[in-house]
Interface confidence: medium
């Protein structure tokens, strides 16, 4: 059973993940067209199910494409370089899901835009945080 200490740490990690994803979303929404229009042409895989920490495997597998899109955007709207931002997200995802159990991610049939993708994972973080508090 998770201790109150480990629950607090998980909550902190989820909050940081949420903050980083929100930062990317805010940065994207600050773009002037046609940059945003171009970014929306990139498709991301969405998880079929995302209700537990192990499902973060699906986010981890999409971090490389996310970094590539952010690099392409070359935005000054982030206080971090895309590489550093994605690195932070990567560390948190790995700490949250662990590496002891291997989980095969199942993806939905429909792909999504970067905005839909980020919103989905932001909602995931909010949902898990609400169960911890």
């Amino acid at each position: 059973a998770p201790t109150s200490s480990s629950t607090k740490k998980t909550q902190l990690q989820l909050e940081h993940l949420l903050l980083d994803l929100q930062m990317i979303l805010n940065g994207i929404n600050n773009y002037k067209n046609p940059k945003l229009t171009r970014m929306l042409t990139f498709k991301f895989y969405m998880p079929k199910k995302a209700t537990e920490l192990k499902h973060l495997q699906c986010l981890e597998e999409e971090l490389k494409p996310l970094e590539e899109v952010l690099n392409l955007a070359q935005s000054k709207n982030f206080h971090l370089r895309p590489r550093d931002l994605i690195s932070n997200i990567n560390v948190i995802v790995l700490e949250l899901k662990g590496s002891e159990t291997t989980f095969m991610c199942e993806y939905a049939d429909e792909t999504a835009t970067i905005v839909e993708f980020l919103n989905r994972w932001i909602t995931f973080c909010q949902s898990i945080i609400s169960t911890l508090t």
Partner: antibody
Framework: QVQLVQSGAEVKKPGSSVKVSCKAS????????INWVRQAPGQGLEWMGR????????DYAQKFQGRVTITADESTSTAYMELSSLRSEDTAVYYC??????????WGQGTLVTVSS | DIQMTQSPSSLSASVGDRVTITCRAS??????LNWYQQKPGKAPKLLIY???SLQSGVPSRFSGSGSGTDFTLTISSLQPEDFATYYC?????????FGQGTKVEIK
Amino acid sequence: QVQLVQSGAEVKKPGSSVKVSCKASGGTFTSYAINWVRQAPGQGLEWMGRIIPIIGRVDYAQKFQGRVTITADESTSTAYMELSSLRSEDTAVYYCARGFVGGFDVWGQGTLVTVSS
Amino acid sequence: DIQMTQSPSSLSASVGDRVTITCRASQDISNYLNWYQQKPGKAPKLLIYGASSLQSGVPSRFSGSGSGTDFTLTISSLQPEDFATYYCQQTYTIPLTFGQGTKVEIK
């Protein structure tokens, strides 16, 4: 309980390189960031960089970029920090430490690197 | 880079005293602030993470507070083993940075 065990003290000449190892035992190694922090005599703590072993992603502090190389060998649960072009100011205790958002919860015992001609 | 400034740089106190150390970040870091204790010749030890969460095994006389840019570490009743140097650290963004340290000495 995870422990990080570092290699022994080193004495190096200016201009040479040093490679410090950090071996994890008793727990998971791959799903955490392994950081390197140094402390010069009588000075504070300075973050040098980190590696996420499971994916080999590395981040460096700007100050050390180009002079430091952080690597990891998953098969032996060991992380390495190599610092090149050593100068006297690099004389310090070098620590490896595990973690990120929730702080560095496990530290190695430290490795003293002395740079002297 | 985010600068972390601790005050005071050193302080003298007696066993039983209430001790407060402050840490200020050069920009908003939410609650991504950790506190460490270091004794001479030893590796730092994590005391507080997330500004206010007590690390497992750390005595309850240690507490942390704050959010945004201003943070505080409090030792409610100083014990002989608490004489050490204390560091704050931000884990909000790369590069991760530490405060310069606060040395707590015996009066």
